[in-house]
Structure formats: structure tokens, C-alpha cells
């Protein structure tokens, strides 16, 4: 239950988050599970612990193994396990299945492909994007923040997309790549079980206390006119309107789009002046039609400009 699979490529940066959460956490200690040997916190080491994060800068195949993190507080110590596998770089263009992140499905307009795990890294825009190893060029492709936007998606856009970015740690740069498949559905006028494109299931969105935050729930329902299709947000299983928090409102984003027939809906959840208590809420993106309901859950976590735990742990 408190174990998480992580993978990366040799000579690239890999950052892994402890799968256990503190309630609260005072310090996080990391160990090599096999030897019980403590992982150093000094940044001069190639592999070092930095609070909730374990950093491989860069990773080596020999780093593969299970790592234990213990989130410590006066009340309870909570243990998690990170199962890390580092693979050799492939000489050819093929990205094997074991290096692939979850597949995403596209809608016809402004299709977004999120770069997996990027939130863990200290990176600066723009991202580089590749499809089947070819650098993406042309006005249809736009690298925006942590995702790729493809305008007027066509069946030919299906394939494996790789994002490449640079992680900076104390002035040193490390390359990171991550690949996921993108599928496009192109059947004639039909309705299918909702496909949520964003957010990813169990996504953790970092927010700053006191600032505004937006969460987009984006789902596709098939092709052609849909008899019934809706996307909405719920807070702790309650409709936004019934929850009674005026700071948190939802508004419809991009409506149904039909130029290639794919019917998709967006709903944006706007949180004004993010407060501590917002971090404790469960945010559910719900997509429903006649086939049924699909739910993706998002949690908010505090984005610290400077994380005490990272410095002192």
C-alpha cells in the first residue's frame, strides 16, 4: 500500500517522492532497504535525500533497488517504500513498455499531453517534445508550461511522446526524459465510457498558500452529438454549489468540439486565496454520460518556496 514504483534512465536525473505523507512530518529519513544504511543528505553526494525527496543526480543502473523512507514526527513514524529501477539507455529509438508512463487520450482541440513527474524537478521552460524520437515542429505543436498542446488532433497524431527537460541542482544541470503514449479515437459518431484526459488519477497539484489555483477537469465522451455528457468537480463527495465555500467555484471551460467529431468538455475549478484547509480536501473530477461515471481524484500539496525539511533534514 505504501510502496511506489519509480523508474529512470542512467545518466539522467531521477527524483522520487516518499509515498508516505506526514500528518505532520518533522523529518524524513531515507535508507537503502537491503542494507538499512542511511542515505546522506549532503548535496555533494550523487544520491542524496532532501526531505520528502530522494535525488539521483545522475542515476546509475546500480542504483536500482528498494528504498525506505521514514516520515518522522513526535506522534508516529510512517514508513514508505520506493521501488526504483534504472535502465540503460536504448541505442535505437524504441521506448520499451517498462519506461512508459500512463497513456493519455486526445480530444480534437487543444489536446494536452502532460509531461510525467515534472513537478518533482527544478526545471525551466520550454520543454522539448519528441514524437517517436523526432523533434516536434510546426504551428500545431505548442510547448506550454508542463504540457504539450496539439491543435486539431488527427488520427496520425497517435504515438509515443517524449518530453525532455533540464533539472538544475545547485548550478549543475541534469537531463530528464519521460515518455507516454497518446491515442486518438476516430470512429464515426458513437458514445463511449468517459475518458478523463486531465487531471491524472491521484495527481498531486502543488499550490501556494494565499495564491489562486486552477484545476481543469477535461474529459471526452465519444464522437458526434452526445445525448448526455457532463464534467464537474466535487469536494469531499459534495457538489461545489452545496459545499458552501465561496472561494471555490467551477466554471465551464472549452465546450463540446466537433471539427473531427470528438466530443469533449472542460470544467475549471478556481480556488481563490488558497488556505491551509484546502490541502485537506479531496478534489474529484467527475465525467459522466449514459455509459457511466469516471472519477479522478486530485490532492493539493503546499508548494514551499524554500522547504525547511529539504534544508535541514
Amino acid at each position: 500500500k505504501f510502496s511506489k514504483q519509480s523508474w529512470g534512465l542512467e545518466n539522467e536525473a531521477l527524483i522520487v517522492r516518499c509515498p508516505r505523507q506526514g500528518k505532520p512530518s518533522y523529518t524524513v529519513d531515507w535508507y537503502y532497504s537491503q542494507t538499512n544504511k542511511s542515505i546522506p543528505t549532503q548535496e555533494r553526494n550523487r544520491v542524496f535525500a532532501s526531505g520528502q525527496l530522494l535525488k539521483f543526480l545522475p542515476a546509475a543502473v546500480a542504483d536500482s533497488g528498494i528504498y525506505t523512507c521514514i516520515v518522522r514526527s513526535p506522534t508516529f513514524n510512517r514508513t514508505g517504500y520506493a521501488n526504483v529501477t534504472i535502465y540503460k539507455k536504448q541505442s535505437d529509438c524504441n521506448v520499451p513498455d517498462y519506461l512508459m508512463y500512463s497513456t493519455v487520450s486526445g480530444s480534437e482541440k487543444n489536446s494536452k499531453i502532460y509531461c510525467p513527474t515534472i513537478d518533482l524537478y527544478n526545471w525551466t521552460a520550454p520543454l522539448e517534445w519528441f514524437k517517436n524520437c523526432q523533434a516536434l515542429q510546426g504551428s500545431r505543436y505548442r510547448a506550454h508550461k508542463s504540457f504539450l498542446v496539439i491543435d486539431n488532433v488527427m488520427t496520425e497524431d497517435a504515438g509515443d511522446y517524449t518530453c525532455k527537460f533540464i533539472h538544475n541542482e545547485n548550478g549543475a544541470n541534469y537531463s530528464v526524459t519521460a515518455t507516454r503514449s497518446f491515442t486518438v479515437k476516430d470512429e464515426q459518431g458513437f458514445s463511449l465510457f468517459p475518458v478523463i484526459g486531465a487531471p491524472a488519477q491521484n495527481e498531486i497539484k502543488e499550490v501556494e498558500i494565499g495564491k489562486n489555483a486552477n484545476l481543469t477537469c477535461s474529459a471526452c465522451f465519444g464522437k458526434g452529438t452526445q445525448f448526455l455528457a457532463a464534467v464537474l468537480w466535487q469536494l469531499n463527495g459534495t457538489k461545489i454549489t452545496d459545499f458552501g465555500e465561496p472561494r471555490i467555484q467551477q466554471e465551464e471551460g472549452q465546450n463540446q468540439s466537433f471539427s473531427n467529431g470528438l466530443a469533449c468538455l472542460d470544467m475549471v475549478l478556481r480556488i481563490a486565496d488558497v488556505k491551509e484547509e484546502d490541502l485537506l480536501l479531496q478534489y474529484d473530477c467527475l465525467a459522466l454520460n449514459l455509459h457511466g461515471l469516471r472519477r479522478h481524484t486530485v490532492r493539493l500539496s503546499r508548494k514551499n518556496p524554500i522547504d525547511h525539511h529539504s534544508i535541514y533534514c
Epitope: 508516529f76 469531499n236 484547509e277 490541502l279 535541514y312
Partner: antibody, heavy 118, light 112 residues
Framework: QVQLQQSGPELVRPGASVTLSCKAS????????MHWVKQTPVHGLEWIGA????????VYNQKFKGKATLTADKSSSTASMELSSLTSEDSAVYYC???????????WGQGTTLTVSS | DIVMTQAAFSNPVTLGTSASISCRSS???????????LYWYLQKPGQSPQLLIY???NLASGVPDRFSSSGSGTDFTLRISRVEAEDVGVYYC?????????FGSGTKLEIK
């Protein structure tokens, strides 16, 4: 918004036991520890103990070991505290209080008044 | 156990002026992670305590910035820059450095 709704006032006889409850809403119950605090005019605020609803693990102030027993029901998002072998010393207001990922005692229930009297 | 010491009453203050409330711990509340685990709570008459300050100097959500806190590892001061009528109540300091968590006996804010 986060709410901790505690059960109503209790009047019990010495030697009896009582269970106080605290129903959480407005957040994910298992993502927060639940703590219990006793308040009396003589001793002020005293920390009794805590439970992690996710695992059921508990920790107690030595002073209240054997006196208080903490439990949590995930299905109803309710934490409970049983107080046993009651004496007049146990007469107090008891608060449940929830933690966040950053600190303890972030949210407080309205308190339950316990009176032990024959 | 760590003992938290507070005076029972503050010096009486006039509305609109500043007030200071002191607290002392029997042991340094500075953790090895660099954080000082000192907290301030206000209990208004007939209400539950509410968090004002966490980790010595951080304002809790929804608390007006008239409140501030400072201190060393063992001596702490809560300041209210412009006292309002709604600030009346008992102010408690508490430590969350180690178990058992302990509270001060509380300082009652007196208005002239």
C-alpha cells in the same frame, strides 16, 4: 470547510465508563491525526493522546494511559475516546483536535462537557 | 515533560494600542530541522481554542496580521499591534517538539 462535531454533554456516575465521539467533515479523515485534549480550571489544557485513523495506531500521554482509549471508524469519519473508571477528577471539557500536514491542533471541535457525579 | 510557563494576566491594554504576552519553555523548542515548535492559541470566552501562530512565527490561515510572534528557543513573545475588542480571551502557548505535548497555563488579555 473543516468541521469537528463532538457529542453532547454527559453526566455519569463515578466508576462508570463513557465514550465521547467526534465526527469529522470537510476533509479526508485518514489524512489527519486526531488528538484529544482535556481542559479543567485547575490543570488547564492537557494533551491526552492521538490516533492515526489510517492505521489505527495510537499514542498516549503517560498520565492518561489506562484511563483513555482512542479509536477511529474510517467508514463514518468518526473518532472516539472511551474514558473508564470515572472519578470527579475526570470532570472536564474534552476537545478533539485535528492536524494538517504542517502542524498539530489545527482544527478543534466545540468540546464535550463531562460531569462525573453521584 | 517540557513545562510551558505563562503569567496569568497581561498588563491591561487600551483598545487600539499594542499588547505583548510572554511564554517560556523549560527546554529549547528548536528541532534539528531548524524549526521552532512553539504555537499560540486564543480561547475566546465560551469557545474552543483556535490556532493563531504555528512554528513560532507563522500566522495561521485567517488570522489577522495584527498578530505576530518572535523568540529564541526558550523565550517567546506574542504581539498584538492594535488590540481590538474581539481579541479578548485567554492566550495559550504550547510546544509540539516532543511528547507529551504541553500547554502553558494561559494569559488572560485585560482591557483597560
Amino acid at each position: 470547510q473543516v468541521q469537528l462535531q463532538q457529542s453532547g454533554p454527559e453526566l455519569v456516575r463515578p466508576g462508570a465508563s463513557v465514550t465521547l465521539s467526534c465526527k469529522a467533515s470537510g476533509y479526508i479523515f485518514i489524512d489527519s491525526e486526531m488528538h484529544w485534549v482535556k481542559q479543567t480550571p485547575v490543570h488547564g489544557l492537557e494533551w491526552i493522546g492521538a490516533i492515526d485513523p489510517e492505521t489505527g495506531d495510537t499514542v498516549y500521554n503517560q498520565k492518561f494511559k489506562g484511563k483513555a482509549t482512542l479509536t477511529a471508524d474510517k467508514s463514518s469519519s468518526t473518532a472516539s475516546m472511551e474514558l473508564s473508571s470515572l472519578t470527579s477528577e475526570d470532570s472536564a471539557v474534552y476537545y478533539c483536535t485535528g492536524s494538517t500536514t504542517d502542524y498539530y491542533f489545527a482544527y478543534w471541535g466545540q468540546g464535550t462537557t463531562l460531569t462525573v457525579s453521584s | 515533560d517540557i513545562v510551558m510557563t505563562q503569567a496569568a494576566f497581561s498588563n491591561p491594554v487600551t483598545l487600539g494600542t499594542s499588547a505583548s504576552i510572554s511564554c517560556r519553555s523549560s527546554k529549547s523548542l528548536l528541532h534539528s530541522n531548524g524549526i521552532i515548535y512553539l504555537y499560540w492559541y486564543l480561547q475566546k470566552p465560551g469557545q474552543s481554542p483556535q490556532l493563531l501562530i504555528y512554528q513560532m512565527s507563522n500566522l495561521a490561515s485567517g488570522v489577522p496580521d495584527r498578530f505576530s510572534s518572535s523568540g529564541s528557543g526558550t523565550d517567546f513573545t506574542l504581539r498584538i499591534s492594535r488590540v481590538e475588542a474581539e481579541d479578548v480571551g485567554v492566550y495559550y502557548c504550547a510546544q509540539n517538539l516532543e511528547l507529551p505535548f504541553t500547554f502553558g497555563s494561559g494569559t488572560k488579555l485585560e482591557i483597560k
